[in-house]
Amino acid sequence: MMTGTIETTGNISAEKGGSIILQCHLSSTTAQVTQVNWEQQDQLLAICNADLGWHISPSFKDRVAPGPGLGLTLQSLTVNDTGEYFCIYHTYPDGTYTGRIFLEVLESSVAEHGARFQIP
């Protein structure tokens, strides 16, 4: 029986050109995590395997960094990075747990606009 739950950072936003950490956490189970896949829609971004370590997909190697922990860091964000991200936990003996994160990449921050029009 699968008793675990995945907690994620949920819906997050970040600024174009910046970076963001995608985090998932598996709790309420004693199952052994054998592998975590990070996917964007149907594209594989990276895999962290308990035996083989981290492997980043070649097409994302320049913009994706492993960690912290089982999380994933996306760098040099573009508006095209907006969308759904999934952390897929492969565990033994439970099976597979999936978490979802929605990332919105914004053109510029409210803070930047505000600073531009500050009255002295």
Partner: nanobody, 117 residues
Amino acid sequence: EVQLVESGGGLVQAGGSLRLSCAASGSTFSIYAMGWFRQAPGKERELVASISWSGDTTNYADSVKGRFTISADNAKNTVYLQMNSLKPEDTAVYYCAAGSVYGRNSWGQGTQVTVTS
């Protein structure tokens, strides 16, 4: 499922070389990385080297850096471990492993490497 068969182990004098091969068959489309591990008597299994299936990323244990080289031939579905400047402490059973996108690693049966001084 992926099946792995290792070969190339043997007895060699310190300072010598060996080349291990690991041939993969079955669901090789699911492989994203492969690695060589070793286990000496009374010790835990350790990762020696790994390579992404595309061949663009390699990782090595500190103890073998500069001496061992891992490479992949996708056309032959084979991964190699070239071991140079072998030391007696490299003596172990060497295992090949394949990581699958589906989350289950496949393992070979192992090949014995013995380095004499």
